[in-house]
Amino acid sequence: PEPPTACREKQYLINSQCCSLCQPGQKLVSDCTEFTETECLPCGESEFLDTWNRETHCHQHKYCDPNLGLRVQQKGTSETDTICTCEEGWHCTSEACESCVLHRSCSPGFGVKQIATGVSDTICEPCPVGFFSNVSSAFEKCHPWTSCETKDLVVQQAGTNKTDVVCGPQDRLRA
């Protein structure tokens, strides 16, 4: 019979024949022959392979280094890598999450539009007219100015994007 030019899924072509790939969690020890099956070996502790493969070495699990602000989100198995995330108050610097940086704080005059997560930084927005923020914070939104009218008071000092209005008593007209 003609030697194959293509193989089925979960197989690979070598020496003009189709050999079975090793399943996830195992690595290749020796290719199949006309008389023998592919020989595979389980990955050891702290190693993984996440696909059907013909790799001769398993990959080492990622180490979530606390010195870089990292912690384990999900422990690795023989078929999956460890997933790292950042400690509270920090976020990943890249999709691979190899290190972390402190969440950005929004300066006075700016409020938090979106709170940071383990993988994304704080998103700030300028406080629009009628709102203010007088602190540097990674959590505080812009607060609305106090409504003096609802307290039966009048505005004594106008608000800004960094300060609230100052309310005071209404002047009484003398008879």
Epitope: V29, L41, C43, G44, E45, E47, Q60, P66, R71, K75
Partner: antibody, heavy 118, light 106 residues
Framework: EVQLVQSGAEVKKPGATVKISCTVS????????IHWVKQRPGKGLEWMGR????????KYDPKFQGRVTMTADTSTDTAYMELSSLRSEDTAVYYC???????????WGQGTTVTVSS | QIVLTQSPTIMSASPGEKVIITCSAT?????ILWFQQKPGTSPKLWIY???NLASGVPARFSGSGSGASYSLTISRMEAEDAATYYC?????????FGGGTKLEIK
């Protein structure tokens, strides 16, 4: 800084039970396996077993099966190894150690000496 | 269970001499770890994943091998290398150690 600190030396009578602790700092104990290793005076290293502190899953060497119990308390980041029905051959230093790739140091505790004597 | 046999069990080497310690397994394993232990101290991880040096290990050390045959090599022996070296497999339960190789300085 990663550290594994073990409890102090113990002297036990044959037939008794010993429980050794291993408290880790610098990482969460639930994130990595903790292994226990025995070393008799002047002899080599013997792997006793390991625990996955996250779910309590254990694997023991058959030669210790039935006498050894490994547990972990994730709230205190402490692993424990209990060995029962002690005999003179259990006189040894017992070590706890982590998965090898933790900081590529594979940290070890300082060892706990257990003496079994009548 | 996998039995690891280390060879030699004891040896001495002169400063500057090349040293090779072998570790053979009764069947194939994924990788070997090597530990160094000096008297009265805890073992230290020396080589991981067969060939990677642990943090702080001098570059004169190397590890190699695959399947059932592994080795640790010191390119030029130094006095501080005198210690006992153990290999370990962490592929099949129960995990096992080799019997150790005691390396002395001449």
């Amino acid at each position: 800084e990663v550290q594994l600190v073990q409890s102090g030396a113990e002297v036990k009578k044959p037939g008794a039970t010993v429980k050794i602790s291993c408290t880790v700092s610098g990482f969460n104990i639930k994130d990595y396996y903790i292994h226990w290793v025995k070393q008799r005076p002047g002899k080599g290293l013997e792997w006793m077993g390991r625990i996955d502190p996250e779910d309590g899953d254990t694997k023991y060497d058959p030669k210790f099966q039935g006498r050894v119990t490994m547990t972990a308390d994730t709230s205190t980041d402490t692993a424990y190894m209990e060995l029962s029905s002690l005999r003179s051959e259990d006189t040894a230093v017992y070590y706890c150690t982590t998965s090898y790739y933790v900081g590529t140091y594979g940290y070890w505790g300082q060892g706990t000496t257990v003496t079994v004597s009548s | 269970q996998i039995v690891l046999t280390q060879s030699p069990t004891i040896m001495s080497a002169s400063p500057g001499e090349k040293v090779i310690i072998t570790c053979s397994a009764t069947s194939s394993v994924s990788y070997i770890l090597w530990f160094q232990q000096k008297p009265g101290t805890s073992p230290k991880l020396w080589i991981y994943s067969t060939s990677n040096l642990a943090s702080g290990v001098p570059a004169r050390f190397s590890g190699s091998g695959s399947g059932a045959s592994y080795s640790l090599t010191i390119s030029r022996m130094e006095a501080e290398d005198a210690a006992t070296y153990y290999c370990q497999q962490r592929t099949f339960y129960p995990y096992t150690f080799g019997g150790g190789t005691k390396l002395e300085i001449k």
